[in-house]
Interface confidence: low
């Protein structure tokens, strides 16, 4: 689905647009990007309020609101493989347009540690509550969605567009309509600030086509950091109204002539600008000529000024703007140096954390430390990484290779391990035989025994029922007939399931001794898996029961 711009708020040097439509975070970012912006940042309480205002504007226009919990993507994301950092306000997330880790955050709830997949942040609006300024939208973290599945409950997204500066809205001195078209393709008739390079169409008159006049203006940079429309005098003036309509469109004072004409004027200490509408202070610093955080310092007698930069910044060639000093040029850090506005910070590569001797030093993170291990069973710390391993009878599983899954040796890729019945257990397996056969000393083959109508041998003895440490849900053993003894027909789907009675003798040969579980498990009837081939009892290759064991040292775990 597409996305419609429904609302726009311009303030300072940025405009925020709110869009409705079920898109993934990537699609939303692409949408913002096409018009020269990014998914919005929320780097301060003030910015959170601007974003909330544009959402309030959007929601006011939504005809039918079905969701009572609405989510809107913002530009806060964490890449796959980058772990949560609870010590930071942004918890290891970063803004899509780049920029430093900001101090403001407003998380909805404590974040779950997960490094497996990319995670994205949306603003969570509880529409069941009145949308009050004091109740800023919470940050909700989750999957980023995909084109087919845009993300649960995502209603839309917020874009941010940054500009060199803004023009004041055009003031009309009589009836008329202004339509602004912004560089990010939004049209609006009411903006509290109008971004640089926007066009303004002014249609004067009260709707009577014969009287309508049209004007076209462009918000231009008239001088460094001074933006205006290049219009002179109030627009749509009418002798019928004089100063009575919108103060004649004047910024401060409006003076009427006897013929219905009027002029704009300014209060003491202010001067009229070239547009003949706006007033500016006579103090040279009041027009804020200094940029980039520079402070304007008045010269003697209040005639001229100089710009002064804060620590970590220096004046550029214009002597008006402050530029950041790049402290990283001096390589002050052991691993990564991030230049920040007015300073720098040292960062460590993934798998390392700040620490060790010296400023900006890094030390290996022991992911396998007690209470921290991401692995279900074995964990080996390496320099800057780790890898997981599993005990015998288990293999690595899970998207990130941190879980262990029981190997069903009875259906293993190496073919059947037992000559007759195979019982899979957690981390191991046992062989058994059909009635009339007994398990050979090798624990795999079956030999003809005394005639008996007893059950197949196989259920583990009490001491063999222990489960591997780290295993999760115990599974019932499954009995799989593999090769039937020579001369006996192979099991068919009609074969009645052998019953296990408590008084029948049971033989089993555990291939691997396991620690007892402490409490005996309930023995479950084995299920019969039908074999594909029937041949006489055979010794496994090498005549060694080691074929039944399985070990996996694992692969690298993910950070």
């Amino acid at each position: 689905t597409g996305a419609d711009t429904e609302a726009v708020v311009c303030v300072g040097t940025a405009c925020y647009t709110a869009h409705s439509g079920k898109l993934s975070a990537a699609e939303a970012q692409n949408h913002c990007n096409q018009n020269g912006g990014n998914l919005a940042t929320v780097k301060s309480k003030e910015e959170a309020q601007h974003v909330q205002r544009v959402l309030a504007q959007l929601l006011r226009r939504e005809a039918a609101l079905t969701a009572r919990m609405s989510k809107f993507w913002i530009g806060l994301q964490r890449e796959k493989g980058k772990c949560l950092d609870p010590s930071l306000p942004l918890k290891g997330f970063s803004w899509v347009g780049g920029g430093e880790d900001t101090p403001y955050s407003n998380w909805h709830k404590e974040l779950r540690n997960s490094c497996i997949s990319k995670r994205c942040v949306s603003l969570l609006l509880d529409l069941s509550q009145p949308l009050l300024p004091s109740r800023l939208p919470k940050w909700s973290e989750g999957p980023c969605g995909s084109p087919g599945s845009p993300g649960s409950n995502i209603e839309g997204f917020v874009c941010k567009f940054s500009f060199k500066g803004m023009c004041r809205p055009l003031a009309l001195g009589g009836p008329g309509q202004v339509t602004y078209t912004t560089p990010f393709q939004t049209t609006s008739s009411s903006l509290e600030a109008v971004p640089f390079a926007s066009a303004a169409n002014v249609a004067c008159g009260e709707g009577d086509k014969d009287e309508t006049q049209s004007h076209y203006f462009l918000c231009k940079e008239k001088a460094p950091d001074v933006f205006d429309w290049g219009s002179s005098g109030p627009l749509c003036v009418s002798p019928k109204y004089g100063c009575n309509f919108n103060n004649g469109g004047c910024h401060q004072d409006c003076f009427e002539g006897g013929d219905g004409s009027f002029l704009c004027g300014c209060r003491p200490g202010f001067r009229l600008l070239d547009d003949l509408v706006t007033c500016a202070s006579r103090n040279p610093c009041s027009s804020s000529p200094c940029r980039g955080g520079a402070t304007c310092v008045l010269g003697p007698h209040g005639k001229n000024y100089t710009c002064r930069c804060p620590q970590g910044y220096q004046l550029d060639s214009s002597q008006l703007d402050c530029v950041d000093v790049d402290e990283c040029q001096d390589s002050p850090c052991a691993q990564e140096c991030v230049n920040t506005p007015g300073g720098f910070r040292c960062e460590c590569w993934v798998g390392y954390e700040p620490g060790g001797p010296g400023e900006g030093a890094c030390q290996d993170v022991d992911e396998c430390a007690l209470g921290r291990s991401p692995c279900a069973q074995g964990c080996t710390n390496t320099d800057g990484s780790f890898h997981c391993s599993c005990e015998e009878g288990y293999v690595l599983a899970g998207e990130d290779g941190t879980q262990c899954q029981d190997v069903d040796e009875c259906v293993g890729p190496g073919g059947p391990l037992c000559d007759s019945l195979c019982f899979n257990t957690q981390g191991s397996f046992h062989c058994g035989c059909l009635p009339g056969w007994v398990l050979a000393p090798n624990g795999v083959s079956c030999t003809m025994g005394p005639v008996s109508l007893g059950p197949p041998s196989g259920p583990p003895d009490e001491e063999d029922k222990g489960e591997k440490e780290g295993s999760t849900v115990p599974r019932a053993a499954t009995a799989s007939p593999t090769r039937g003894p020579e001369g006996t027909p192979k099991a068919t789907p009609t074969t009645s399931r052998p019953s296990l009675s408590s008084d029948a003798p049971i033989t089993s040969a555990p291939l691997k001794m396991l620690a007892p579980s402490g409490s005996p498990g309930v023995w479950r009837e084995p299920s019969i898996h039908h074999a594909t081939a029937a041949s006489g009892p055979q010794e496994p290759a090498g005549g060694d029961s080691s074929v039944a064991t399985q070990n996996n040292d694992g692969t690298d775990g993910q950070k």
Epitope: V11, E46, Q49, H50, Q52, R53, A56, Q57, L59, R60, A63, L65, R68, S128, Q129, P130, L131, L132, P133, S134, E192
Partner: antibody, heavy 120, light 111 residues
Framework: QVQLVQSGAEVKKPGASVKVSCKAS????????MHWVRQAPGQGLEWMGE????????YYNQKFKGRVTMTRDKSISTAYMELNSLTSDDSAVYYC?????????????WGAGTTVTVSS | DIVMTQSPDSLAVSLGERATINCKAS??????????LNWYQQKPGQPPKLLIY???NLESGVPDRFSGSGSGTDFTLTISSLQAEDVAVYYC?????????FGGGTKVEIK
Amino acid sequence: QVQLVQSGAEVKKPGASVKVSCKASGYTFTSYWMHWVRQAPGQGLEWMGEIDPSASYTYYNQKFKGRVTMTRDKSISTAYMELNSLTSDDSAVYYCARSVYYGNKYFDVWGAGTTVTVSS
Amino acid sequence: DIVMTQSPDSLAVSLGERATINCKASQSVDYAGDSYLNWYQQKPGQPPKLLIYAASNLESGVPDRFSGSGSGTDFTLTISSLQAEDVAVYYCQQTNEDPRTFGGGTKVEIK
């Protein structure tokens, strides 16, 4: 035109409950919050709470929490305000008023008011 | 709760003269550039009527002799030329915080 029509005057004994209704017409009932405001004789205005007729969510002034219940019947575009454990201090004119859904929730349309008298 | 204090309690103004009512909030009712402050007019035996919302926006159908100004904690309602039908009690209201609170009212009479 947009109208909020309230139920008639009520006389109640202390300890009793009162339920006032407010029928909306001329606009989409579920697109605006409905508020209740009361005014004691010769006194100012006091906001009691609001209900979202769309989903029946309520938001009460803490002063009345536990005593007030706001409900609505979408099928007949009517909002209700019930106040329990009445005392003589609850004698007032009770107004319903609608507000926009988001942002500055000013009350642009008011009912004519329902006079509730609590007397033994 | 935000306390709204109106002054004066009552005001007597001659017909055609200017009437000014003040409203002070115990804390700022501004939010991201908007003032969440509204003015209502109440005539005897009638419900309140919205005059101005967001400090300075005139509600449609309200005569333009009414105007509002102010921001933060200090707000003013001005009637530029008092008419006989303007005799009423005027209330300010903040909608920036819960609970939404009203001022005590200012009674405007003709001198």
